[in-house]
C-alpha cells in the first residue's frame, strides 16, 4: 500500500545530508488561533477527555499534509478567550486567559531528489521544525509596565 | 463486517436545529476519522467536514462552518452530525462515510452509511 | 478550494463497449484521486483510488490511469449491472471536492 517512493539520493551525495536537512524556523499553523466566542461551546465539562475538562478548554483542528510525515497533525484551538470557572464550568474568569501552548515538532517532508546534471531521483526527506499548538493553558495576564 | 447506521428520515421546520447519529460496527471506531457527504437532489456530492473518534479532531469545508458540527461519542461508537439553523437549501440526503487509509498516500471512504434523508419545510 | 471537472456528463453506450470518463482538477493533484460508483437509489462505493488502485472486490474490468491534472477511469467491457453515476474525488487538500458525476446508460 505504501506509494511513497523510496528515497534514493543520488550516488556520491552524503546520504544523512541528502535526507535530512535541518530546518530551525518553525512553520507556523495554517491559521492564527482565534478563541471561539460562542458561549455555548465555552464550558469545562465535568467528564470525557481532558481538553473538554479544562478551565481553558479546547478542540482540535486537523492539518493534513500528504507530503510531510506525519501526515496528520492536530492543532489544538482555545474555545473560551478568558478561563472558565472551576465552581460553575460556564462563567469565564476575566482575571485569567486562555492561551495555546506550542510546541516544535520534528517533521519529515517528501521533496523530489535531484541528481547528477538535475535530473529527478526519486523522494528524499527533508527535516524541519513544525509549531504545533497542543493545548489551552488558563495563565495570568501579561501585566503591561 | 464494517457497518455504519444512521439514523432515519427527518423532516424539519425551517429554523430549527437536528441531529443525525452514525453508529459504527465492525471496528475500531478510534481507528478510523469518519467523514460527512452532503447529496442534494440525488445529484452532486459536497463534503461537508470529517473528525477523528480518537481526539475529537476536526476539519470542515469552510461552506458548512456554522451550519454543521462534527462530535463522537467514542462509548457507543458514534458519530455524530449536528445541522443548525436549517433552511430549504439543506434538504438533502446525508452520508457518513469512514476514511479508509494505509498509512501513507491513500485517503478514501471505504464504507458508506445508508444515508439520511433531511426535508426541510414548514 | 480544488475544482473537479468531469466529462462526460452523461453517456450512453451498448454492453460490451469500452468507456472512458475523465476527470480535470483545477490544480495538479498528484496521483490522489478516488473513484467513486452510485447505482440508482443506493449508496456512493469505492471503486478505485489513489488513481489506479482497485478496491477489494471491484471487477478487474474497471480501471483508472493518470498523474497531475488529467484522470481517466477506463470500463473494458460494459455489462448491465454497471449503469450508475461515477463520480471523481480528490483528496490532495482539504476540503475534500468531487466531480460533479458522469451517468453512465445502456444503450
Known amino acids: 500500500y505504501s506509494h511513497w517512493p523510496s528515497c534514493c539520493p543520488s550516488k556520491g551525495q552524503d546520504t544523512s545530508e541528502e535526507l535530512l536537512r535541518w530546518s530551525t524556523v518553525p512553520v507556523p499553523p495554517l491559521e492564527p488561533a482565534r478563541p471561539n466566542r460562542h458561549p455555548e461551546s465555552c464550558r469545562a465539562s465535568e467528564d470525557g477527555p481532558l481538553n473538554s475538562r479544562a478551565i481553558s478548554p479546547w478542540r482540535y483542528e486537523l492539518d493534513r499534509d500528504l507530503n510531510r510525515l506525519p501526515q496528520d497533525l492536530y492543532h489544538a484551538r482555545c474555545l473560551c478567550p478568558h478561563c472558565v470557572s472551576l465552581q460553575t464550568g460556564s462563567h469565564m474568569d476575566p482575571r485569567g486567559n486562555s492561551e495555546l501552548l506550542y510546541h516544535n515538532q520534528t517533521v519529515f517532508y517528501r521533496r523530489p531528489c535531484h541528481g547528477e546534471k538535475g535530473t529527478h531521483k526519486g523522494y528524499c526527506l527533508e527535516r524541519r521544525l513544525y509549531r504545533v499548538s497542543l493545548a489551552c493553558v488558563c495563565v495570568r495576564p501579561r501585566v503591561m509596565g | 463486517e464494517v457497518q455504519l447506521q444512521q439514523s432515519g428520515p427527518e423532516l424539519v421546520k425551517p429554523g430549527a436545529s437536528m441531529k443525525i447519529s452514525c453508529k459504527a460496527s465492525?471496528?475500531?471506531?478510534?481507528?478510523?476519522?469518519m467523514n460527512w457527504v452532503k447529496q442534494s437532489h440525488g445529484k452532486n456530492l459536497e463534503w461537508i467536514g470529517l473528525i477523528n473518534p480518537y481526539n475529537g479532531g476536526t476539519s470542515y469545508n469552510q461552506n458548512f462552518k456554522g451550519k454543521a458540527t462534527l462530535t463522537v461519542d467514542k462509548s457507543s461508537s458514534t458519530a455524530y452530525m449536528e445541522l443548525l439553523s436549517l433552511t430549504s437549501e439543506d434538504s438533502a440526503v446525508y452520508y457518513c462515510?469512514?476514511?479508509?487509509?494505509?498509512?501513507?498516500?491513500?485517503?478514501?471512504?471505504?464504507?458508506w452509511g445508508q444515508g439520511t434523508s433531511v426535508t426541510v419545510s414548514s | 478550494d480544488i475544482q473537479m471537472t468531469q466529462s462526460p456528463s452523461s453517456l450512453s453506450a451498448s454492453v460490451g463497449d469500452r468507456v472512458t470518463i475523465t476527470c480535470s482538477a483545477s490544480?495538479?493533484?498528484?496521483?490522489?484521486l478516488n473513484w467513486y460508483q452510485q447505482k440508482p437509489g443506493k449508496v456512493p462505493k469505492l471503486l478505485i483510488y489513489?488513481?489506479?488502485s482497485l478496491h477489494s472486490g471491484v471487477p478487474s474490468r474497471f480501471s483508472g490511469s493518470g498523474s497531475g491534472t488529467d484522470f481517466t477511469l477506463t470500463i473494458s467491457s460494459l455489462q448491465p449491472e454497471d449503469v450508475a453515476t461515477y463520480y471523481c474525488?480528490?483528496?490532495?487538500?482539504?476540503?475534500?471536492?468531487f466531480g460533479q458525476g458522469t451517468k453512465l446508460e445502456i444503450k
Open positions: 462515510a469512514r476514511e479508509g487509509y494505509d498509512g501513507y498516500l491513500y485517503f478514501a471512504m471505504d464504507y
Open positions: 474525488q480528490q483528496y490532495s487538500k482539504l476540503p475534500y471536492t
Open positions: 465492525g471496528y475500531s471506531f478510534t481507528d478510523y476519522t
Open positions: 489513489y488513481t489506479s
Open positions: 490544480q495538479g493533484i498528484s496521483n490522489y
